[in-house]
């Protein structure tokens, strides 16, 4: 694959991943009410990083923002921070990579400057992707912990009517935003790696020495050091690796409620 193609593809993949990170951060469905093996309710609860929502079977949806900073769990704050760091680094990465693209000519910028910028943007995309993946994974871990805790206390609060009153705890499971976040983080990371690989192809090559003639025992023997060709892999017959994005569907694709649980 040519340097330009690798750099361009890396940029596009990172851009898609970055858009996904923004989408995941804004989505309300980071955690959704667990519907499996649960008393069936006519309301569906789901939560995001910024607000929690309830959708009734009437179709009426009400969302409430978390209008507090101090009252929120530290883990949620950490996830927010990681996602925002991912977005900020992504924005900087995109801006830098636009100027670094080989197909765009800006003034008298030489290849070594473009190579440095490509490497910088690649590193930024890698950190951005890792930040998003860590953020989503921390949230997922938090969900798993809470899920099993609430499963253990599934029916709590035996008070009221002679110990017969049951309080059903709402259990939460992975929402669509987690999958969007993982895929997006992965794409941003892959795009960043591709940018870093492209940087190596843009760097002026010092390892390609010209053929030198040596005079030994009156014979002219020309040594062609073909084996010292720069081992970037570009221009060689390296196979093109395709990246498959399974795509992430949001929960609201089936907003008309019914699936396994056709109860909301």
């Amino acid at each position: 694959m040519s340097v330009t193609a690798c750099q361009g593809l890396g940029f596009v993949v990172s851009l898609i991943g970055f858009a996904g990170i923004i989408a995941a951060t804004c989505m309300d469905q980071w955690s959704t009410q667990d519907l499996y093996n649960n008393p069936v309710t006519a309301v569906f609860n789901y939560q995001g990083l910024w607000r929690s929502c309830v959708r009734e079977s009437s179709g009426f949806t009400e969302c409430r923002g978390y209008f507090t900073l101090l009252g929120l769990p530290a883990m949620l704050q950490a996830v927010r921070a990681l996602m925002i760091v991912g977005i900020v680094l992504g924005v900087i990465g995109i801006l830098v990579s636009i100027f670094a693209l080989k197909c765009i000519r800006i003034g008298s910028m030489d290849d070594s400057a473009k190579a440095k910028m490509t490497l910088t943007s690649g590193i930024l995309f890698i950190i951005s992707g890792i930040s998003a993946i860590i953020g989503v994974s921390v949230f997922a871990n938090m969900l798993v912990t809470n899920f099993w805790m609430s499963t253990a206390n599934m029916y709590s609060g035996m008070g009221g009517m002679g110990g017969m009153v049951q309080t059903v705890q709402t259990r939460y499971t992975f929402g669509a935003a987690l999958f969007v976040g993982w895929v997006a983080g992965g794409l941003t990371l892959i795009g960043g790696v591709m940018m870093c690989i492209a940087c190596r192809g843009l760097t002026p090559d010092d390892s390609n020495f010209k053929a030198v003639s040596y005079h030994a025992s009156g014979q002219n023997v020309a040594y062609r050091p073909g084996g010292f060709k720069a081992s970037t892999g570009f221009g060689s017959n390296t196979r093109n690796k395709k990246i498959y994005d399974g795509g992430a569907r949001t929960e609201d694709d089936e907003q008309s409620h019914p699936t396994k649980y056709d109860y909301v």
């Epitope: 069936v40 309710t41 006519a42 056709d262």
Partner: antibody, heavy 118, light 113 residues
Framework: QVQLQQPGTELVKPGASVKLSCKAS????????MHWVKQRPGQGLEWIGN????????NHNEKFKSKATLTVDKSSSTAYMQLSSLTSEDSAVYYC???????????WGHGTLVTVSA | DVVMTQSPSSLTVTAGEKVTMSCKSS????????????LTWYQQKPGQPPKLLLY???TRESGVPDRFTGSGSGTDFTLTISSVQAEDLAVYYC?????????FGSGTKLEIK
């Protein structure tokens, strides 16, 4: 405004089946669950089940699972409930009502009185 | 299934009096997501279909007189009529509108002296 038209009465023989209709107008029929409620003469209300007109997804009260079959016809904005193997216990007024805020039932049909008699 | 228990089963009052009726559920009807209680009150007059009075335990449906108020949370709910009128003669039902299957209470019959 929301209107739900139900036939006034249905006289059926024991063991037979009857298909009750509920024609809706004044709102987007396919967007809201349609509920069915039974009321025996002088008795309280019993929830039978509901159906979502957009895809036919339904929920049933276990008590009526083998008794009532809920269907819809989107083209005519009509919900149906078929009652099978009728006995005197099935003699009642059957209401249809679409879901509303708070999962409540704000609009009710006038009800169909089903009389099971030989 | 959620059991809804209404008391008393009947009440006889004079016009202008204040009336309270109770409804208890076997499971909490409070949704943690929005802190709303999914309990509904209906009024049914003889020969008519039920009429929605209150949803979310205390939200009055439009057109319902403000003498009707709902209160309570979790499992214990109350319907209060501040000053009973002759037209309030009816049976009042509470309904669980949170868990499937939806269930109704057996009703409280309000009679006017």
């Amino acid at each position: 405004q929301v209107q739900l038209q139900q036939p006034g009465t249905e006289l059926v023989k024991p063991g037979a089946s009857v298909k009750l209709s509920c024609k809706a107008s004044g709102y987007t029929f396919t967007s809201y669950w349609m509920h069915w409620v039974k009321q025996r003469p002088g008795q309280g209300l019993e929830w039978i089940g509901n159906i979502h007109p957009s895809n036919g997804g339904s929920n049933h009260n276990e008590k009526f699972k083998s008794k009532a079959t809920l269907t819809v016809d989107k083209s005519s904005s009509t919900a149906y409930m078929q009652l099978s193997s009728l006995t005197s216990e099935d003699s009642a007024v059957y209401y249809c009502a679409p879901i509303y805020y708070g999962n409540s039932l704000a609009y009710w049909g006038h009800g169909t009185l089903v009389t099971v008699s030989a | 299934d959620v059991v809804m228990t209404q008391s008393p089963s009947s009440l006889t009052v004079t016009a202008g009096e204040k009336v309270t009726m109770s409804c208890k559920s076997s499971q909490s009807l409070l949704n943690s997501g929005n802190q709303k209680n999914y309990l509904t009150w209906y009024q049914q007059k003889p020969g008519q279909p039920p009429k929605l009075l209150l949803y979310w335990a205390s939200t009055r449906e439009s057109g319902v007189p403000d003498r009707f108020t709902g209160s309570g949370s979790g499992t214990d709910f109350t319907l209060t009529i501040s000053s009973v009128q002759a037209e309030d003669l009816a049976v009042y039902y509470c309904q669980n509108s949170y868990f499937y299957p939806f269930t109704f209470g057996s009703g409280t019959k309000l009679e006017i002296k």
